[in-house]
Interface confidence: low
């Protein structure tokens, strides 16, 4: 019969032969012959693949190194790799998340608009009129000016983006 | 052979201060974090510090935090532990131990002998 | 603050099984190691990222870890395996040693 020249799925050709792929977890240690199947390996304990294959080497799981303000995620099997996050206040610099950053704060006259989460930075807004922020913080929103007239004061001194009214006794008339 | 040696242990007053150094020999001592971990008499192990290879990154334990300091001089292979406003209760043998690398997981794969740190009037 | 867990003392005869606990909340979800340390010596590392073997410990050594508990197992213990054992792990970029557990060979 004609050598074939392609193979089914979960085969590879190799010596005009088709031969099994070796299932994700395990690496190839050596190609089937006319009278033997594909012989195949489970990855190390520290080692991956997460494809039907015939790779020799299985890949190291990834290290999320604490140095970078990496944690694990997500421990890595035999057929999935680890997946890395940013501890607490930080996030990924990349969607690889290689490495983490510090999240931003949000500056005095601005608010917290979307707190951080492990991939994404914080989205800070400007304080519009009738709020404000008067700290940077990373968890804040702008904080609404008080309502002087609920309380039965006046407005003393005006609120800006950065500061609250400040609120007084009204000026009684004495008879 | 892979080998660690603390030095600069012994008596000191309440509030006092010490420097503890640890030589480094037998591997390359700029590629891997380093640590401290103290053991208090009949006492488990207690981790005081660590720092990364490049001496940027630096953790400590809350009960040292702002007291301690540890750092590195690549070119000599040599860690160090400044120790100030030491407490009795910083009493003990402190180990120097080398982080076991890339694929170790933050592991502690050789440790030295240690050296002992008594703080008492 | 995170904390692990392990018993005071574990007792075993010789050549049989000593399994050693050592339990943290997630405890599976981080990497575990293990140190074997006797009297006046420093601490060994006998198992790093949960289960496997620094080069030179014995394959009687083994370890795993899910849930919220690792757990150290000694088959065919050996007189030289008594010792204190702590487990360690990394959480929010501090270590944290379990209190040790004293192993005693019967």
């Known amino acids: 019969p004609e050598p074939p020249t392609a193979c089914r799925e979960k085969q590879y050709l190799i010596n005009s032969q088709c031969c099994s792929l070796c299932q994700p977890g395990q690496k190839l240690v050596s190609d089937c012959t006319e009278f033997t199947e594909t012989e195949c390996l489970p990855c190390g304990e520290s080692e991956f693949l997460d494809t039907w294959n015939r790779e020799t080497h299985c890949h190291q799981h990834k290290y999320c190194d604490p140095n970078l303000g990496l944690r694990v995620q997500q421990k890595g099997t035999s057929e999935t790799d680890t997946i890395c996050t940013c501890e607490e206040g930080w996030h990924c610099t990349s969607e690889a998340c290689e490495s983490c950053v510090l999240h931003r704060s949000c500056s005095p006259g601005f608010g917290v608009k979307q707190i951080a989460t492990g991939v994404s930075d914080t989205i800070c807004e400007p304080c519009p009129v009738g709020f404000f922020s008067n700290v940077s913080s990373a968890f804040e929103k702008c904080h609404p000016w008080t309502s002087c007239e609920t309380k039965d004061l006046v407005v003393q001194q005006a609120g800006t983006n950065k500061t609250d009214v400040v609120c007084g006794p009204q000026d009684r008339l004495r008879a | 052979e892979v080998q660690l040696v603390e030095s600069g242990g012994g008596l000191v007053q309440p509030g006092g201060s010490l420097r503890l150094s640890c030589a480094a020999s037998g591997f390359t001592f700029s590629s891997y974090a380093m640590s401290w971990v103290r053991q208090a008499p009949g006492r488990g192990l207690e981790w005081v510090s660590t720092i990364n290879n490049s001496g940027g990154g630096t953790y400590y334990a809350d009960s040292v935090k702002g007291r301690f300091t540890i750092s590195r001089d690549n070119s000599k292979n040599t860690l160090y532990l400044h120790m100030n406003s030491l407490r009795a209760e910083d009493t003990a043998v402190y180990y120097c131990?080398?982080?076991?690398?890339?694929?170790?997981?933050?592991?502690?794969?050789?440790w030295g002998q240690g050296t002992t740190v008594t703080v008492s009037s | 603050s995170y904390e692990l867990t392990q018993p005071p003392s574990v007792s075993v005869s010789p050549g049989q099984t000593a399994s050693i606990t050592c339990s943290g909340d997630k405890l599976g979800d981080k990497y575990a190691c293990w140190y074997q340390q006797k009297p006046g010596q420093s601490p060994v590392l006998v198992i790093y990222q949960d289960s496997r073997r620094p080069s030179g410990i014995p394959e009687r050594f083994s370890g795993s870890n899910s849930g919220n508990t690792a757990t150290l197992t000694i088959s065919g213990t050996q007189a030289m395996d008594e010792a204190d054992y702590y487990c360690q792990a990394w959480a929010s970029s501090t270590v944290v040693f379990g209190g040790g557990t004293k192993l005693t060979v019967l």
């Open positions: 131990a080398k982080e076991g690398g890339k694929y170790y997981y933050y592991a502690m794969d050789v």
